[in-house]
């Protein structure tokens, strides 16, 4: 906290220029207008002030905004959000994607910290719902950013969303997300051909169901192996040898080499030894 | 209410084979989704697996007790046995036996029984 | 074989607290991690399967987390009868294999 003191003589601040890194943090205090900083925010990013002349600063806009920031200030706060703590976030109403995009930016390069997990999480709620632009603006930042929400999350994200997603966006998904995810995957595509709903359906496949599966084994696709593998257990386990057969094509060979892997273990051990004979690959169930 | 229940002798000689019997109950051996599994632990120690038997017959070793090891299923009487022959007192533990489900993990076990090897 | 890395191999904790357990593969085994809980004198419990899923009938303050080679067991708040060890465990590969245990104790 720094003292109340009155701004020496000659030392009031007329506009938020260079001079001011020069400035005492208490001078700072004293001489800095809150209003004026808030209408020229937009400057402050421009000037190499210090640590410490920046918690001064933040401590006049915090006195002048004691229930949040307005919009109109946190859209230019630039690298002072760098200094904001999640509590300070949560008073914000940020309903701006190009708002959401500036202090994305600022933080740009580094893992996702409290900081801008709250204020994601504040604009998401603002808007009711992930809709696509959010969604591109937030896996761009954060390629992980959809495999780091809840499937209660996930359930708030429209189908028509799905169209932004990337096959890396989902890397690190584990299965109860892909469970949620995949239905409006299916939803989203649905008036796709075949080898093009395949290409888009692909990166979802670890929510999908037996059912869809067995339907897709028709179709020619030719699934990888890396896909494959992460399919769902209980999914897996019901198809039968001709099916996966069907389903993987030319890369059914990869079986033997994840013969020892889940889920290929699990269905080579349900398979009658007559039937995966068939596929001349040497498996034992 | 699946349960599971250990039996053998609780002193094994050195050299001899240890045998011991999970018997099932509440439940079938020949249901699609388990396995059912051998884990033992020694005094003091952590958990090793031993070896998984499908109902089917196939079965699936821990690699470094292999050379050992045999599972056998009798589906008639809903029970799996364990062998481990030429034994040794590094092979005194508590010996559990566990139903495996493959959507989930090891989901039941046995309370354990302790043998020990000595002569 | 795959090896399971726990860490810490012992912690001690008090009541209320957030508890963070932390198992790392030698290998990628997606998501197939489970976690147990095992007392004195008893058989293990299954308490997370598949990195994430709570196992039915545990309670909501465990939960997992992870995939590839890194997982996380949390405990959100201590409770006297979660003073156990901990394991994990990987049904990737066929040969199952556990982590050292964490055991849990009371500060």
């Known amino acids: 906290e720094v003292e109340k003191t009155a701004c020496p003589s000659g030392k009031k601040a007329r506009e938020i220029d260079e001079s001011l890194i020069f400035y005492k943090k208490w001078e700072l205090e004293a001489c800095v207008d809150a209003a004026l900083l808030a209408t020229q925010m937009d400057r402050v990013n421009a000037i190499p002030f210090t640590y410490e002349q920046l918690d001064v600063l933040k401590h006049k806009l915090d006195e002048l905004y004691p229930q949040g920031y307005p919009e109109s200030v946190i859209q230019h706060l630039g690298y002072l959000f760098l200094k904001m703590s999640p509590e300070d976030i949560r008073k914000w109403n940020v309903t701006s994607l190009e708002t959401l995009k500036a202090l994305l930016e600022v933080n740009k390069g580094h893992e996702m910290s409290p900081q801008v997990a709250t204020l994601i999480d504040r604009f998401v709620k603002g808007r009711g719902q992930l809709d696509k632009d959010t969604l591109d603006t937030l896996t761009a930042f954060y390629p992980g950013y959809l495999c780091s929400l809840s499937p209660e999350e996930l359930s708030s994200v429209p189908p028509s969303s799905i169209w932004a997603v990337r096959p890396q966006d989902l890397d690190t998904c584990d299965p109860r997300q892909l469970d949620v995810l995949y239905p409006k995957a299916r939803l989203a595509f649905q008036n796709m051909n075949g080898s093009e709903y395949f290409v888009k359906i692909q990166s979802f496949l670890g929510g999908a169901p037996t059912e869809d599966l067995k339907a897709l084994s028709q179709q020619n696709v030719s699934m990888d192996l890396a896909t494959f593998m992460k399919l769902r257990t209980d999914a897996v386990l019901p198809l039968t040898v001709a099916e996966v057969q069907k389903l993987l094509g030319p890369h059914v060979e990869g079986l033997k080499a994840e013969e020892r892997h889940r889920p290929v273990r699990d269905w080579i051990l349900r398979q009658r030894q007559d039937d995966l004979d068939t596929l001349g690959l040497g498996l034992q169930g | 209410q699946v349960q599971l229940q250990e039996s053998g002798p609780g002193l094994v000689k050195p050299s001899e084979t240890l045998s011991l019997t999970c018997t099932v109950s509440g439940g079938s051996v020949s249901s699609f989704t388990d396995t059912w599994s051998w884990i033992r632990q020694p005094p003091g120690k952590g958990l090793e697996w031993i070896g998984y038997?499908?109902?089917?017959?196939?079965?699936n070793y821990n690699p470094s007790l292999k050379s050992r090891v045999t599972i056998s299923v009798d589906t008639s009487k809903n029970q799996f046995s364990l062998k481990l022959s030429s034994v040794t007192a590094a092979d005194t533990a508590v010996y559990y036996c566990a139903r495996e489900d493959a959507l989930t993990g090891f989901d039941i076990w046995g309370q354990g029984t302790m043998v020990t090897v000595s002569s | 074989d795959i090896q399971m890395t726990q860490s810490p191999s012992s912690l001690s904790a008090s009541v209320g607290d957030r508890v963070t357990i932390t198992c790392r593969a030698s290998?990628?085994?997606?998501?197939?991690l489970n976690w147990y809980q095992q007392k004195p004198g008893k058989a293990p419990k299954l308490l997370i399967y598949?990195?994430?899923s709570l196992q039915s009938g545990v309670p909501s303050r465990f939960s997992g987390s992870g995939s590839g080679t890194d997982f996380t067991l949390t405990i959100s708040s201590l409770q006297p009868e979660d003073f156990a060890t901990y394991y994990c465990q990987q049904p990737y590969d066929a040969s199952y294999t556990f982590g050292g245990g964490t055991k849990v104790e009371i500060k």
């Open positions: 038997i499908y109902y089917s017959g196939s079965t």
């Open positions: 598949a990195a994430s």
């Open positions: 290998q990628s085994i997606s998501s197939y």
